[in-house]
Amino acid sequence: EEELQVIQPDKSVLVAAGETATLRCTATSLIPVGPIQWFRGAGPGRELIYNQKEGHFPRVTTVSDLTKRNNMDFSIRIGNITPADAGTYYCVKFRKGSPDDVEFKSGAGTELSVRAKPSAPVVSGPAARATPQHTVSFTCESHGFSPRDITLKWFKNGNELSDFQTNVDPVGESVSYSIHSTAKVVLTREDVHSQVICEVAHVTLQGDPLRGTANLSETIRVPPTLEVTQQPVRAENQVNVTCQVRKFYPQRLQLTWLENGNVSRTETASTVTENKDGTYNWMSWLLVNVSAHRDDVKLTCQVEHDGQPAVSKSHDLKVSAHPKEQGSNTAAENTGSNERNIY
């Protein structure tokens, strides 16, 4: 009778993560009597995957009933495959021995490759906000995919970006891989509504790439422009001074009125109007009584935006002037108006 051979017909098996792998093995003879064991890897450090004789292997089932006397099919199924299961699996026939069974013959091995999907890309921007014309960096990370080949693209509002660097780790063989990419984006004043998108394509995704997004609204700071104007209102001795705060983002803004350098009033932007580009406008005003003034008054609108150093705009109020013919009195009727008498 010919000596027993252990046949593993599949050189390699490719399985998607989460699925079941079938590893085939047959023996050409029933003798010598003895059990079959499955190992991952070879040599002294090999890992026992299944032992016909004893042990608990909850993820492993046998294809046929190994307790049957004439069974020569030692194929197994491994459930819920993960990238960590990748490797070469050997079906090994033992002969009965004492005190331990003795390895008799091994199959040639079956390489199990695991296809694992990348995790959803996570895009993160800079820790601090930046202003238009500045270049900021965005990072994109995705993990746990296999095989190593992967494609990553960056987009800003649908337009592909070219200024980015990507690394896939580790460089050598591994059960699964991670990708890390950094893209540089130049901010513009119109970017409040913009999005940066990281798109990852992998063989496991069947042409339906994964995307991670970052809203530039989290990154950009558009500093306001200020304009201070005066208008006459109702009585000849009252002047309405307005401070127009335009095109700012984010909304966090504090305005202080100074009269000849002294703090007159501080308020926080609340009832703002939003522009189409996502920036905000806000207006604050003072009703100034000039009748008691002998000298000119210097009014300053000082704005602290998003914790940045204050910017200001001043307006000189001439007390000798009679501005009754300028503008209209509509601002005085605004419910947000604030009267301020100067003595």
Partner: antibody
């Protein structure tokens, strides 16, 4: 025909030795183990030991250790069991059997038995 | 050593009866249990291996079940030729041990 043929009955005096043979035919001798089991008159079955016909490795029952030796001759497909320093309580029918389980031990083919009587 | 305890030690039954013999191992032996039939002056004969597998040529009225420590041999309809002594045997590890036997006698 698959069978195990044992040697004939023996009468021995206490302190003597006995060697029982078991000749296999009809199958590949080296593919299976051989066990020896004895049965004293009116008693149950007692496992004595096991030998690999492939490599000659052995495993003996603790109580017989030092008195029993099991061997094989692959050229004649024969297994032997020698028991030394015989005592009267060694009087029994001695069976050889083929051990056929893959990852366990069970015995699917038995010899007819050899009666060994130890008497002064 | 693994002790094998068989019960009952004897049972009286009639032809056609259903007979159940139990065997308990002192520790878990998975499914590595065999059952043998022995008639007077004859060698034991393997009936069941690996707890529940019927040995080739054995009538289907014999069946085995159990795993771990508790096992059962059932003869579904006793026949005249079934009057004999039955032994269980653990085959999980050395030393191999047998139960004390159950004698099935004619009522």
């Amino acid at each position: 025909q698959v069978q195990l043929v044992q040697s004939g009955a023996e009468v021995k005096k206490p302190g003597a030795s006995v060697k029982v043979s078991c000749k296999a035919s009809g199958y590949t001798f080296t593919g299976y183990g051989i066990v020896w089991v004895r049965q004293a008159p009116g008693q149950g079955l007692e496992w004595m030991g096991w030998i690999s016909a492939y490599a000659g490795e052995t495993n003996y029952a603790q109580k017989l250790q030092g008195r029993v030796t099991m061997t094989t001759d692959t050229s004649t497909s024969t297994a032997y069991m020698e028991l030394r320093s015989l005592r009267s309580d060694d009087t029994a029918v001695y069976y050889c059997a083929r051990e056929a389980g893959s990852s366990w031990y069970d015995f699917d083919l038995w010899g007819r038995g050899t009666l060994v009587t130890v008497s002064s | 050593d693994i002790q094998m305890t068989q019960s009952p030690s004897s049972v009286s039954a009639s032809v056609g009866d259903r007979v159940t013999i139990t065997c308990r191992a002192s520790q878990g032996i998975s499914s590595w249990l065999a059952w043998y039939q022995q008639k007077p002056g004859k060698a034991p004969k393997l009936l069941i291996y690996a707890a529940s597998n019927l040995q080739s040529g054995v009538p289907s009225r014999f069946s085995g079940s159990g795993s771990g420590t508790d096992f059962t041999l059932t003869i579904s309809s006793l026949q005249p030729e079934d009057f004999a002594t039955y032994y269980c045997q653990q085959g999980a590890s050395f030393p191999i041990t047998f139960g004390g036997g159950t004698k099935v006698e004619i009522k």
